[in-house]
Each structure stands twice: as C-alpha cells, then as structure tokens.
C-alpha cells in the first residue's frame, strides 16, 4: 500500500491584516475524484480543527459560510487562505488530505506550517 506524501511550507508570516496563505500539495497515489482537506491547529499539544472542505477534482473548494478559510485547487495543489488571525492564533497549522473516492482510501498528513501572527501596532493618536 503506497503512502501519500503531503507537503506544506515550514513557516508563513501572516499579513498585518491577519491573513495567511500557504499551499498544501499532495502526491496522489491514485486518480482521486473526491478529496477532503482539513486544516488543524496545534498549540501546546492541543489540536483543534480550523476548517475542512470536500471537493471534486476540477471543482472549487467549498468551506462552510462561517469558515475563516478559503481556498482554490489546481491538480494536486490546494491554495489555502486563513483570515481573521490574531497573535493568539500563532501555532502549527497542519494540512491533512484524504482521498475519499474512488477506493482505496488514502490519508496524508503534512509536517505543519508554523504561522506567526503579529497584531498590528495601534495607530498613534493624531493631533488633528
């Protein structure tokens, strides 16, 4: 049974607006038509699900309406964007990819992307 390798960048810095983007790329052992991508956040050994989307190859990723994630897919690459991040959200963001259909099922977990978020400095008070 072949393994499925998932690659993601080691470090990403969020923008001053609290937006972080990274690519999650998987080496598909087969020709999957249905793929599920999950982003998990690990901080202090606690793991929580940030967002998840299931998509059909060739179609757009659809996250829930209230999700902080958006994304697009191109072949075996998923471009993920996480919004609304604050300094307290700094942590390791793990990309998990599942090839749901057709069988056989495959699961791959990336090494994680350390996302650093720095809250912007407040604007100095204006004299005017």
């Amino acid at each position: 049974c072949k393994a499925m390798h998932v690659a993601q960048p080691a470090v990403v810095l969020a923008s001053s607006r609290g937006i972080a983007s990274f690519v999650c790329e998987y080496a598909s052992p087969g020709k999957a038509t249905e793929v599920r991508v999950t982003v998990l956040r690990q901080a202090d050994s606690q793991v929580t699900e940030v967002c998840a989307a299931t998509y059909m190859m060739g179609n757009e990723l659809t996250f829930l309406d209230d999700s902080i994630c958006t994304g697009t897919s191109s072949g075996n690459q998923v471009n993920l964007t996480i919004q609304g991040l604050r300094a307290m959200d700094t942590g390791l963001y793990i990309c998990k990819v599942e090839l749901m259909y057709p069988p056989p099922y495959y699961l791959g977990i990336g090494n994680g992307t350390q996302i650093y978020v720095i809250d912007p400095e407040p604007c100095p008070d204006s004299d005017f």
Epitope: A3, L40, Q42, S45, V47, T48, E49, I94, L107, I109
Partner: nanobody, 115 residues
Framework: EVQLVESGGGLVEPGGSLRLSCAAS????????MGWYRQAPGQQRDLVAH???????MYADSAKGRFTISRDNAKKTVYLQMNSLKPEDTAVYYC?????????WGQETQVTVSS
C-alpha cells in the same frame, strides 16, 4: 525509530468477538492518527477504521455497527473491538500510524472467522 506491535488476532467462530491491539514505540508527533486496514486473499488492502489523537474517528462502511475503534494516547495504543464476526471478515489485519509528514505500517495479524 517508530515501531508498531500488534496483538489479538486468531481463530474465532462466526458471531464471535476479537479485540486487536497495536502499540507504538518511539517518538511520535502529538497529533497523529492510528488505524486499521485489512486485506482478504486476492483483494486490495482496505481501511477498516482510524482514530486521531484528538478523538476524530472514521469507519469504513463495512465496519460500521460491528467494529469499534478506540485508543489510549498515553500508551500510544489503538484498539479494534470486532463483534458479530462473519466469515467475510477473515483477512490479514494491519495497524497503521500517521504522524506529521510520515506514516508507518505494523506487522500483520491474521484473523480467521470459521466454524
């Protein structure tokens, strides 16, 4: 180096139960997924169930209702409780561990359901 040690396989009559165990040794990431696959003669190796360290569980359709997966994070051990076994559950069962950036297979354990 990560190693997986399985136990609990054997011969059981139809309708009986077995509990498989798989213990991981070595250093593994705090987020990980442990699970079971099985391979019947002449068939491909198929997922039975898996469970993540944060408790998320997935079952294959063939395992729903009769099989229960659980784990002890402190012992780095996963269990597969198999009830109401049928002859078609006869297969070689494999433990699998997914960690950040890697995965590992255990040694096989044979499960035979026959009267």
């Amino acid at each position: 180096e990560v190693q997986l040690v399985e136990s609990g396989g054997g011969l059981v009559e139809p309708g009986g139960s077995l509990r498989l165990s798989c213990a991981a040794s070595g250093s593994i990431s705090s987020y990980n997924v442990m699970g079971w696959y099985r391979q019947a003669p002449g068939q491909q190796r198929d997922l039975v169930a898996h469970i993540a360290s944060n408790g998320e569980i997935m079952y294959a359709d063939s395992a729903k209702g009769r099989f229960t997966i659980s784990r002890d994070n402190a012992k780095k051990t996963v269990y597969l409780q198999m009830n109401s076994l049928k002859p078609e559950d006869t297969a070689v069962y494999y433990c699998k561990l997914w960690v950040l950036g890697n995965d590992y297979w255990g040694q096989e354990t044979q499960v035979t359901v026959s009267s």
